[in-house]
């Protein structure tokens, strides 16, 4: 059936019908107010409607639910729990809906939920148990395969007195519920660092997007266990150099493609190993585009064109020879 707007179905001219429906389990073909539904496509779209809460009368057939561009503010526990449950719901998009709080168990009772997009919400308070649903040390496995969390960092003045990176990682790791996660996007979140334990506990990852953050170093991050990883996006960060340990780990991953564009590479003596690696590796995509940012004399030099003589470090003068 073609998408139907519920505005005509539930107008003020049918008050009895509206109240009768709200008191009973939803009819299989009804569509919530301010939404568009297509049973044939198993899709419900409640887009740019300034909704302040998740509609209660979602049709049981829904497989793809778009709740983007609203003003939801808070996603409470069991926000999508229904009787009967939304057993078919596989893809849920909540991007750009002004969510600042996602509570524990917000996505409980969605047994088929494989894709979740919370991007472009200023999540000042993401419960550690938002995705696991319980505070048990080992939770029931989440069905999530794709988790999209791009640009969920709140404005600085709205952040709690805790590390934003820590808050997000706590939610990713709680109860080991996301062991089956294959795609994780964390782009544009001002991440300064990646907690060292996060990747080790997401062994099924195929795609990891950390682009457009503020990562300075990967020294304490281990990719060794991510044997299924196919793409690693590190573009537009603050990376200065990749050290031997990281190079070896990336080189050994059997399916990997790495994206490193637009980082402020420091082309001094510490860059020698990375340049040697870049000249031979096939895992870095677009490696011929990587250029030096520092020191000033090296700015815009192509990394692949450097040789060891180019990569020097200014000698450290003993204190007696230093000038003020």
């Amino acid at each position: 059936s073609s998408p139907t707007s519920s505005a005509s179905s539930f107008s003020s001219s049918a008050p009895f019908l509206a109240s009768a429906v709200s008191a009973q389990p939803p009819l299989p073909d009804q569509c919530p107010a301010l939404c568009e539904c297509s049973e044939a496509a198993r899709t419900v779209k409640c887009v740019n409607r300034n909704l302040t809460e998740v509609p209660t009368d979602l049709p049981a057939y829904v497989r793809n639910l778009f709740l983007t561009g609203n003003q939801l503010a808070v996603l409470p526990a069991g926000a999508f729990a229904r009787r009967p449950p939304l057993a078919e719901l596989a893809a849920l998009n909540l991007s750009g809906s002004r969510l600042d709080e996602v509570r524990a168990g917000a996505f409980e009772h969605l047994p088929s939920l494989r894709q979740l997009d919370l991007s472009h919400n200023p999540l000042a308070d993401l419960s550690p148990f938002a995705f696991s649903g319980s505070n048990a040390s080992v939770s029931a496995p989440s069905p999530l395969v794709e988790l999209i969390l791009n640009h969920i960092v709140p404005p600085e003045d709205e952040r709690q007195n805790r590390s934003f990176e820590g808050m997000v990682v706590a939610a990713l790791l709680a109860g080991r519920a996301l062991q089956g996660l294959r795609r994780l996007e964390l782009a544009s979140n001002h991440f300064l660092y990646l907690p060292r334990d996060v990747l080790a506990q997401l062994p099924s990852l195929r795609h990891l997007d950390l682009s457009n953050n503020s990562l300075v170093s990967l020294t304490y991050v281990s990719f060794r266990n991510l044997t299924h990883l196919e793409s690693l996006h590190l573009e537009d960060n603050a990376l200065k150099v990749l050290h031997n340990g990281t190079l070896a780990e990336l080189q050994g991953l059997p399916h990997i493609r790495v994206f490193l564009d637009n980082n402020p590479w420091v082309c001094d003596c510490h860059m020698a190993d990375m340049v040697t690696w870049l000249k031979e590796t096939e895992v870095v995509q677009g490696k011929d585009r990587l250029t030096c940012a520092y020191p000033e004399k090296m700015r815009n030099r192509v990394l692949l064109e450097l040789n060891s003589a180019d990569l020097d470090c200014d000698p450290i003068l003993p204190p007696s020879l230093q000038t003020s």
Epitope: A248, Q251, G252, H255, R257, T281
Partner: antibody, heavy 122, light 111 residues
């Protein structure tokens, strides 16, 4: 399911030309390096060359024995790989296999086609 | 180019026996901690089939009687208990440097 199907083999005279095709399916073609490997009758395997993926600009590498005579190309809209063979010699007679490199190409080829026979003879 | 030498040329064993195939490289095939050496199985009239990658990683779907070992320049493919369906030619291949090269092959046959 990954599938590679070669075609275009046949009998050609020395000095002639032939174009082999490989139709790929079951994976995102532009993400992968693709290669040609050949095997002369009763002999071992010989790497002919590869073409890189989108991220690495679809550039090519060849073995010394075919460089300047053979050209590997790809039509990504058709998920097809090609081998244009010019100035053919009798020693180019072989079964030609199309193969997909693993995501990390350093680990070489994980899927192969069944091959197409090229015979260069007068 | 890197030359790979396989031995023996032919290996005749009874079913259930252990098969040990060797591949030696003319220079190291190691790069940043990984040896880029593969083993392929080819049965008559068929395309090669990947068994082992990175010297010791068993490709998915390959029986666990196949294993690979070695690093640097010396590598071994082991079939722990030979089965009749393992009759084939086995090739090693290095992908450390362009051009990629193959060994001459070891033919495994049943005695």
């Amino acid at each position: 399911e990954v599938q590679l199907v070669e075609s275009g083999g046949g009998l050609v005279q020395p000095g002639g030309s032939l174009r082999l095709s490989c139709a790929a399916s079951g994976f995102t073609f532009t993400d992968y390096y693709m290669s040609w490997v050949r095997q002369a009758p009763g002999k071992g395997l010989e790497w002919v060359g590869f073409i890189r993926n989108k991220g690495n600009g679809y550039t090519t590498e060849y073995s010394a024995s075919v460089k300047g005579r053979f050209t590997i190309s790809r039509d990504n809209s058709k998920s097809s790989l090609y081998l244009q063979m010019n100035s053919l010699k009798t020693e180019d007679t072989a079964v030609y296999y199309c193969a997909r490199y693993r995501g990390n190409p350093h680990y070489a080829m994980d899927y192969w086609g069944q091959g197409t026979l090229v015979t260069v003879s007068s | 180019e890197i030359v790979l030498t396989q031995s023996p040329g032919t290996l005749s064993l009874s079913p259930g026996e252990r098969a040990t195939l060797s591949c030696r490289a003319s220079e190291s095939v190691e790069f940043y901690g990984t040896s880029f050496l593969q083993w392929y199985q080819q049965k008559p009239g068929q395309a090669p089939r990947l068994l082992i990658y990175g010297a010791s990683n068993v490709e998915s779907g390959i029986p666990d009687r196949f294993s690979g070992s070695g690093s640097g320049t010396d590598f071994t493919l082991t079939i722990s208990r030979l089965e009749p369906e393992d009759i084939a030619v086995y090739f090693c291949q290095q992908s450390r440097k362009v051009p990629s090269t193959f060994g001459g092959g070891t033919k495994v046959e049943i005695k």
